[in-house]
Amino acid sequence: EPPTACREKQYLINSQCCSLCQPGQKLVSDCTEFTETECLPCSESEFLDTWNRETRCHQHKYCDPNLGLRVQQKGTSETDTICTCEEGLHCMSESCESCVPHRSCLPGFGVKQIATGVSDTICEPCPVGFFSNVSSAFEKCRPWTSCETKDLVVQQAGTNKTDVVCGPQDRQR
């Protein structure tokens, strides 16, 4: 039996199964009982990424430097431009419409994962035996100094923000 619905990459209009326009092209005119669908390529600054019946192509995304953005991948007639953030910044959202500076890890916290153009710094509290005395977007928690290996003794215990203070051993006379 003849189909009541059109096949893949087709659409039904005026009792005709018309071919969709391929990615990178927009619809100029629907097919008719005697003519095929007419499509035209998108212009340089535009794209369509699916088989479609759109009469207008989508504008490529603009990577606004004033928002900290730069082009990661130039758009084609079939793909949108991909933006990423300038060094030291990361995307505010998944759509990456603007950028914010990477977060620094406060004293007592170290960097677990360094930020990228799309993800912020991930901090972790310094566990016992480690410390961070700076606010940094790069520094990990550092281990306390080992006084013993220096033939010294702990004079002041370390914390998550400070290193231990070593001193000479008391000589019994």
């Epitope: 096949r7 009792s15 005709q16 199964c17 071919s19 008719t32 009982e33 005697f34 095929e36 669908t37």
Partner: antibody
């Protein structure tokens, strides 16, 4: 059952005129585009003309443009082909044919009517 | 206009054999708007395949169509006695629609 019955063929002199008719039944005539296709004796098929379901648009082969006129009367379920300025090379069996549902192909054909152009 | 060239002109085969008919277009046939018809002597043509690969109603599955762009093929997997006839391809990409000159499949 779909039926297409052509009539109006016959012998005509070069330069003469003839009007072919195609009576349709067994389907909703006004929903379908229709066509005329011809076949010269011992030769292949040649698409002659087509008309949209509503009659709004008409199409012709270059060989008949300006001489032949396709038309339809949806109230009478009939397709026509007015042929003027006939030439010897128009001698052929003329078939009317309907479009298949949804697509541009011809699924039902009449048995044809013979047009002979000769002096 | 789009010119369709069919090959071979004549195909001599025995029942049970496979038949492969070719149809080549002078320019790309948009979106595979190509049909195949069978015609026997004294009869009107019969639609076999449309949009290059869709079988028309009531057509046995030994008939199959393939191809796109400028090259199309009609295959009859096992010839039955009733399949010996003339086969035409036809494009309906844009008017004027055109037919190939036909391929005659005859009994060897």
């Amino acid at each position: 059952e779909v039926q297409l019955l052509e009539s109006g063929g016959g012998l005509v002199q070069p330069g003469g005129s003839l009007r072919l008719s195609c009576a349709a039944s067994g389907f909703t005539f006004s929903d379908y585009a229709m066509n005329w296709v011809r076949q010269a004796p011992g030769k292949g098929l040649e698409w002659v003309s087509g008309i949209k379901s509503g009659g709004s648009s008409k199409y012709y082969a270059d060989s008949v443009k300006g001489r032949f006129t396709i038309s339809r009367d949806n109230s009478k379920n009939t397709l026509y082909l007015q042929m003027n300025s006939l030439r010897a090379e128009d001698t052929a069996v003329y078939y009317c044919a309907k479009h298949v549902d949804f697509y541009r192909a011809l699924d039902y054909w009449g048995q044809g009517t013979l047009v002979t152009v000769s002096s | 206009e789009i010119v369709l060239t069919q090959s071979p002109g004549t195909l001599s085969l025995s029942p049970g054999e496979r038949a492969t008919l070719s149809c080549r277009a002078s320019q790309s046939v948009k979106n595979s708007s190509l049909a195949w018809y069978q015609q026997k002597p004294g009869q009107a043509p019969r639609l076999l395949i449309y949009t290059a690969s869709s079988r028309a109603t009531g057509i046995p599955d030994r008939f199959s169509g393939s191809g796109s762009g400028t090259d199309f093929t009609l295959t009859i997997s096992r010839l039955e006695p009733e399949d010996f006839a003339v086969y035409y391809c036809q494009q309906s990409s844009a008017p004027p629609w055109t037919f190939g000159q036909g391929t005659k499949v005859e009994i060897k």
